[in-house]
C-alpha cells in the first residue's frame, strides 16, 4: 500500500473550505460519494454524501457541508461553510462502491480552524466566489451506515482547496497561499487501485 498523504489547511473561523475531489473516470460519475471525518482510533465517519445515483451539478447540503458532483469534469466539490474551531480534524473524500469498501479519492485534508480573521474588510476580488450563502435549492441525501475500517490504501490523484468568506468580513490578499495543489498519479494507478483486478503496468506522474 502507498503511504498515506495529508494536506494541511489552516483557516479562520467563518471562512469556507472549498475542496475539489478528482475522480477522473466516467464509470465513477454516478457512484455515490461522501465526505468523511477520521478521528483518532475510530473508523471514518460519513458527514455528508451525494445521492445514489449521484446527480450532476445537484447540491446536497448537510448542515454546513455542501456537496456538488460535476460529472462532466469528473469533480466532486466539497464546501464547509462558516468554519468553526471544532471543525478542525482530518477529512477525506470517498467513492462508495458496494459491496466493495469505500475508496479515498485524494489526500486526506488536515483542517485546522483558528479563531479570528486575517486581512481587512473590504473588496474580495482575489478570493474565489462567495459561497458563504448556502444555495436554496439543495437536497439532503441518505448516507450508507457502512464505513470502512481501512478506507484508504492509495496515494491521491489530486486535490485543490481554496477559501472564501463574506465580503463584509474579510479580504484575502493572497489566495495563492491558501490554494494548495497535489500532483496527479496516473489514472491507470487510480483505476487499478479502485476497481480493476488486472495486473496493469503503471507509470507515475511526478
Amino acid at each position: 500500500a502507498t503511504k498515506l498523504t495529508e494536506e494541511k489547511y489552516e483557516l479562520k473561523e467563518g471562512q469556507t473550505l472549498d475542496v475539489k475531489c478528482d475522480y477522473t473516470l466516467e464509470k465513477f460519475a454516478s457512484s455515490q460519494k461522501a465526505w468523511q471525518i477520521i478521528r483518532d482510533g475510530e473508523m471514518p465517519k460519513t458527514l455528508a454524501c451525494t445521492e445514489r445515483p449521484s446527480k450532476n451539478s445537484h447540491p446536497v447540503q448537510v448542515g454546513r457541508i455542501i456537496l456538488e458532483d460535476y460529472h462532466d469534469h469528473g469533480l466532486l466539490r466539497v464546501r464547509m461553510v462558516n468554519l468553526q474551531v471544532e471543525d478542525s480534524g482530518l477529512y477525506q473524500c470517498v467513492i462508495y462502491q458496494p459491496p466493495k469498501e469505500p475508496h479515498m479519492l485524494f489526500a486526506r485534508i488536515r483542517l485546522v480552524v483558528t479563531k479570528g480573521f486575517s486581512g481587512t474588510p473590504g473588496s474580495n476580488e482575489n478570493s474565489t466566489q462567495n459561497v458563504y450563502k448556502i444555495p436554496p435549492t439543495t437536497t439532503k441525501a441518505l448516507c450508507p451506515l457502512y464505513t470502512s475500517p481501512r478506507t484508504v490504501t492509495q496515494a491521491p490523484p489530486k486535490s485543490t482547496a481554496d477559501v472564501s468568506t463574506p465580503d463584509s468580513e474579510i479580504n484575502l490578499t493572497n489566495v495563492t497561499d491558501i490554494i494548495r495543489e497535489q500532483k496527479l498519479i496516473s489514472e491507470e494507478d487510480l483505476e487499478q487501485k479502485l476497481i480493476s483486478e488486472e495486473d496493469l503496468h503503471h507509470h507515475h506522474h511526478h
Epitope: K27, A29, L75, R77
Partner: antibody, heavy 121, light 111 residues
Framework: EVQLVESGGGLVQPGGSLKLSCAAS????????MHWVRQASGKGLEWVGR??????????YYAASVKGRFTISRDDSKNTAYLQMNSLKTEDTAVYYC????????????WGQGTLVTVSS | DIVLTQSPDSLAVSLGERATINCRAS??????????LHWYQQKPGQPPKLLIY???NLESGVPDRFSGSGSGTDFTLTISSLQAEDVAVYYC?????????FGQGTKLEIK
Amino acid sequence: EVQLVESGGGLVQPGGSLKLSCAASGFTFSTYAMHWVRQASGKGLEWVGRIRTKSSNYATYYAASVKGRFTISRDDSKNTAYLQMNSLKTEDTAVYYCTRDMGIRRQFAYWGQGTLVTVSS
Amino acid sequence: DIVLTQSPDSLAVSLGERATINCRASESVDTFDYSFLHWYQQKPGQPPKLLIYRASNLESGVPDRFSGSGSGTDFTLTISSLQAEDVAVYYCQQSNEDPYTFGQGTKLEIK
C-alpha cells in the same frame, strides 16, 4: 504498454466513404473515451471528435467541420474505436490519429502513429 | 467554440537560452481552479507528445526544463534551456468544453 494502431486509410474520391479503425491494447479500453484528431500536411492539429464510455451512453461529440458526415463508434469487446467518414471532401485529406485521454476531459497521453486519408479525384 | 491563439507563430532561440510560447483562449478554460489546458510537442513524421497537462503539470518522462503556467485565458509554455532535440512544433489544447480545440501551433527552431 498502451498501444493504439490506426488502419483503414487510403485514397478515396470526393463524395466517397471510408471507415478507419483504431485497435487498442495495454489498458482497459472500456474505461476511457476515445478521440480522433487529424492533421493536414504541413498544417496544425484539428480535433475531430470523441466517443465516451458505456457509463455515459457512448455519447459522441464532433467538430463543426465534420458534424453530420463523420460518425465515431466503438466496440468494447474488440477494444476498437471507429471513424466512419461519409461525403468526403478534398479538405478532409489528412493524417488521422486515434488518441486516448486520461479520464473525463483530461489530456491526450496516448496517440497512434496515424493513418493517411487522401481525398482526390 | 473556444479559439486558442498561440504566439509567436515561429520562434528562433539559441541553444541554452529560454524559449517562451504563449497561448490565449477566447474564453476561460478553467473549471473551478482546474485549467483544462495542455501542451504537446510534435516532431516531423511523429504523432504529438504530451508535455504538460492541466496548465502546469509535467508529464511523466518529460525533462524538467519544460514548464507550464497560467490560468483562465492566458497560458505559457517555457523551456528554460533550449536543447537541440527541442526543435519541434508546439501546440496548446483545451478540453474544458466541446468541441475540444488546439492552438495553431508554434514552430521552434535553433537560432
